[in-house]
């Protein structure tokens, strides 16, 4: 037989020879980092047909690293469920806690003994510093110095010195998040007042008032013979401007001799995208169609309408 087989976990006792006689036996032992568990044999014999009898290193078990308890408020999860060297230990903290230290430890061989690559981490409670103070406003629990995970504060605005109140821009409530950061930026308090929206040839149908503050919502409709250019609903935004802008009521053009298919009262037009139809060929209508608010009717191609004078 030629040299006996080699194994990951087992080594030959003594030096290998270039060849072995039939019936000659070689013995193995578990390598460093492994230990023998009976009853499997760790020897082989040179057989009559010049091959070694079957032998495996299954009897050699890996040394194990010391036991690791779950960290307080967390978990130690052995990868592959084993503490054997060559494997990892993963650490996870419960919700509301964060990891201080290594997230993964490795079970490594030091000489003949398996040891962890470092100290197990700890799970600390998520804490937030007080949320930001805001101008012209305050938040609840302003006297608290440390906030725990999911603790919430609510902002409110101070009474305004002048005739117009401060409006709260943004979310009023924020909470201490999982990486010790507040869930969002603090809101702001400022006077927001939009100009009185005037639409000629139209009228306001809801949201009546003398003053229009933050988030005030107004709806319009056009007089008979006019169609709405823009949105029928506008909202007073944080910059004291209407969003979308105040619409216009434009006159419906009279019909001409070449009648297109009849449409109902009005079709609202949008001014967001140009359509390739603006370059369409063929007969063109010479009037603007009446505006319709009925659902189900297509909006006329804006490009076509824009190109008609």
């Amino acid at each position: 037989c030629e040299e006996p087989p080699t194994f990951e976990a087992m080594e030959l006792i003594g030096k290998p020879k270039p060849y072995y006689e039939i019936g000659e036996r070689v013995d193995y032992k578990c390598k460093k980092g492994y230990f023998y568990i009976p009853p499997l044999a760790t020897h082989t014999i040179c057989d009559r047909n010049h091959t070694w009898l079957p032998v495996s290193d299954d009897a050699c078990y890996r040394e194990t690293c010391p036991y690791i308890r779950d960290p307080l408020n967390g978990q130690a999860v052995p990868a592959n469920g084993t503490y054997e060297f060559g494997y990892q230990m993963h650490f996870i903290c419960n919700e509301g806690y964060y990891l201080i230290g290594e997230e993964i430890l490795y079970c490594e061989l030091k000489g003949s003994v398996a040891i962890w690559s470092g100290k197990p981490p700890i799970c600390e409670k998520v804490l937030c510093t007080p949320p930001p103070k805001i101008k012209n406003g305050k938040h609840t629990f302003s006297e608290v110095e440390v906030f725990e995970y999911l603790d919430a504060v609510t902002y409110s605005c101070d009474p305004a010195p002048g005739p117009d109140p401060f409006s709260l821009i943004g979310e009023s409530t924020i909470y201490c998040g999982d990486n010790s950061v507040w869930s969002r930026a603090a809101p702001e308090c400022k006077v927001v007042k939009c100009r009185f929206p005037v639409v000629e040839n139209g009228k306001q149908i809801s949201g009546f008032g003398k003053k229009f503050y933050y988030k005030a919502t107004v709806m319009f409709e056009c007089d008979k013979g006019f169609y709405l250019d823009g949105s029928d609903t506008i909202v007073c935004d944080s910059n004291s401007t209407w969003d979308p802008p105040v619409p216009k009521c434009l006159k419906v053009l009279p019909p001409s001799s070449t009648k297109p298919p009849a449409l109902s009262h009005s079709v609202s037009t949008s001014s967001t995208t140009k359509s390739p139809a603006s370059s369409a060929s063929g007969p063109r209508p010479t009037y603007k169609p009446p505006v319709s608010n009925y659902p189900g009717y297509p909006k006329p191609e804006e490009g076509i309408l824009d190109s008609l004078d």
């Epitope: 032992k29 460093k32 980092g33 230990f35 040394e63 194990t64 036991y67 503490y83 000489g111 003949s112």
Partner: antibody, heavy 120, light 109 residues
Framework: QVQLVESGGGVVQPGRSLRLSCAAS????????MHWVRQAPGKGLEWLSF????????YYADSVKGRFTISRDNSKNTLYLQMNSLRAEDTAVYWC?????????????WGQGTLVTVSS | SSELTQDPAVSVALGQTVRITCQGD??????VSWFQQKPGQAPVFVMY???NRPSGISERFSGSSSGNTASLIITGAQAEDEADYYC????????????FGGGTKLTVL
């Protein structure tokens, strides 16, 4: 055939010292870790100490840490346990046991034991 | 107190099956070794893990494990099985220390 023979036991006064020896034969001593275990009269087994094949790694049970020292002489195929500041509660049969690998492994072979009596 | 807990005494009728148990946190992660000790003799290694027996140990001996409990099972107990049985594994302190259970005295009736 693996053989482990302990010696050095006897009667000793509290506070005194004693050195136990364990002579090994029948295996390549220098490639195996070794353990010491004891058993007080009428009590259970107590693991005491471990030394790796080359003597680099040593571990001790809390009950003997700082008082007992494990060592080995691979040239003499002998394991030792130096016991200092002995107490009455150290009275026990002491065994050396072979590990089944270079490291701690399992305790696959034991000696016949040596009795240590700590008494004034 | 041992970190591996065993029942102090268990009895079994001759020829019946008996289960000797060992409990401990570390057994969720490690196999256990079992030792048999007869009066006045050194302990003898009889089992590791589920079914790893050294040569010379009867096939009546087997092992099992579930969660934090390991068991040594003797099927068809014989009079010569009467002895103290100790489990042995790592301790759960996060060190390299080993620990024995308190031992179980098996009586064959």
């Amino acid at each position: 055939q693996v053989q482990l023979v302990e010696s050095g036991g006897g009667v000793v006064q509290p506070g005194r010292s004693l050195r136990l020896s364990c002579a090994a034969s029948g295996f390549t001593f220098s490639t195996y870790g070794m353990h010491w275990v004891r058993q007080a009269p009428g009590k259970g087994l107590e693991w005491l100490s471990f030394i790796s094949y080359d003597g680099d790694e040593k571990y001790y049970a809390d009950s003997v840490k700082g008082r007992f020292t494990i060592s080995r002489d691979n040239s003499k195929n002998t394991l030792y346990l130096q016991m200092n500041s002995l107490r009455a509660e150290d009275t026990a049969v002491y065994w050396c046991a072979k590990a089944s690998g270079y490291g701690m492994g399992i305790l696959d072979y034991w000696g016949q034991g040596t009795l240590v009596t700590v008494s004034s | 107190s041992s970190e591996l807990t065993q029942d102090p005494a268990v009895s079994v009728a001759l020829g019946q099956t008996v289960r000797i148990t060992c409990q401990g946190d570390s057994l969720r992660s490690y196999y256990v070794s079992w030792f048999q000790q007869k009066p006045g003799q050194a302990p003898v290694f009889v089992m590791y893990g589920q079914n790893n027996r050294p040569s010379g140990i009867s096939e009546r001996f087997s092992g099992s494990s579930s969660g934090n409990t390991a068991s040594l099972i003797i099927t068809g107990a014989q009079a010569e099985d009467e002895a103290d049985y100790y489990c042995h594994s790592r301790d759960s302190s996060g060190t390299h220390l080993r620990v024995f259970g308190g031992g179980t005295k098996l009586t064959v009736l």
